[in-house]
């Protein structure tokens, strides 16, 4: 059995240039793998679409924080 977890590399090459309303967002994933050209966030929308966004943008960081709080509050 392998001693480390192997995950397929997902990269963002382009990021969305407009804000996504928070109520449309379901979850996010951080992309920090150095084999990717830039650090990014992949938002999953409630319709199942995945969108790359730039974590340097304020709305992206605020959305991540909002989703963190929602998921924390859902925990038993």
């Amino acid at each position: 059995q392998p001693d480390s977890v192997s995950i397929p590399i997902t990269c963002c090459f382009n990021v969305i240039n407009r804000k996504i309303p928070i109520q449309r967002l379901e979850s996010y994933t951080r992309i920090t793998n150095i084999q990717c050209p830039k650090e990014a966030v992949i938002f999953k929308t409630k319709r199942g679409k995945e969108v790359c966004a730039d974590p340097k943008e304020r709305w992206v960081r605020d959305s991540m924080k909002h989703l963190d709080q929602i998921f924390q509050n859902l925990k038993p």
Partner: antibody, heavy 117, light 107 residues
Framework: QVQLVQSGAEVKKPGSSVKVSCKAS????????MHWVRQAPGQGLEWMGR????????KFDPKFQGRVTITADTSTSTAYMELSSLRSEDTAVYYC??????????WGQGTTVTVSS | DIQMTQSPSSLSASVGDRVTITCKAT??????LAWYQQKPGKAPKLLIS???SLETGVPSRFSGSGSGTDYTLTISSLQPEDFATYYC?????????FGGGTKVEIK
């Protein structure tokens, strides 16, 4: 692969300033934030501040505000940290590190700064 | 500022032991917690981010858990190369702060 290579060790007098450099390869520094973290001998880690090299925006721990300057030169992929009004308590290893999200996945090798009269 | 309290500050263990290190924040940090390993004379190495996400290449014997203000790093079966100092760090809000560290020594 990513490398952050820092400048060499420094010995400084109290009251003087030190400037440490951090040259990045294998990444575009304007795509990330560059942070500075220090570690006094035998002590823990202490975040000092960070810069967004794309626009020069900085954020600092208030403890260091006014005494630390962080700059970046995207043309040479180098970040700099200057600490002024040095005192003996500033004797530490200073690290640069990268990360947009507030955690640090790549670190420099560290630069030892000794403040002694 | 958010303060991070790590315990124990040191522990002695043997190869094969299960080791648990805890970290407590002074306020909810919503899983924005990282764990690092540091060996003498070296820079810290990121093990876990987001409280539970193992970094690529980090052995699966390392795991993170917790929520709210309380978080745990577990090494399921301690290996010789795991003797080091471990730090937690919150990245919920700047200034980002670290725990005081836990030194894992050979018993």
């Amino acid at each position: 692969q990513v490398q952050l290579v820092q400048s060499g060790a420094e010995v400084k007098k109290p009251g003087s300033s030190v400037k440490v450099s951090c040259k990045a390869s294998g990444l575009t520094i304007s795509d990330t934030y560059m942070h500075w973290v220090r570690q006094a001998p035998g002590q823990g880690l202490e975040w000092m501040g960070r810069i967004d090299p794309a626009n020069g925006n900085t954020k600092f721990d208030p403890k260091f505000q006014g005494r630390v300057t962080i700059t970046a030169d995207t043309s040479t992929s180098t970040a700099y940290m200057e600490l002024s009004s040095l005192r003996s308590e500033d004797t530490a290893v200073y690290y640069c590190a990268r990360g947009v999200f507030g955690f640090f996945d790549y670190w420099g090798q560290g630069t030892t700064v000794t403040v002694s009269s | 500022d958010i303060q991070m309290t790590q315990s124990p500050s040191s522990l002695s263990a043997s190869v094969g032991d299960r080791v648990t290190i805890t970290c407590k924040a002074t306020e909810d940090i919503y899983n924005r917690l990282a764990w690092y390993q540091q060996k003498p004379g070296k820079a810290p190495k990121l093990l876990i981010s987001g409280a539970t996400s193992l970094e690529t290449g980090v052995p699966s014997r390392f795991s993170g858990s917790g929520s709210g203000t309380d978080y745990t790093l577990t090494i399921s079966s301690l290996q010789p190369e795991d003797f080091a100092t471990y730090y937690c760090q919150q990245f919920w809000s700047a200034p980002y702060t670290f725990g005081g560290g836990t030194k894992v020594e050979i018993k």
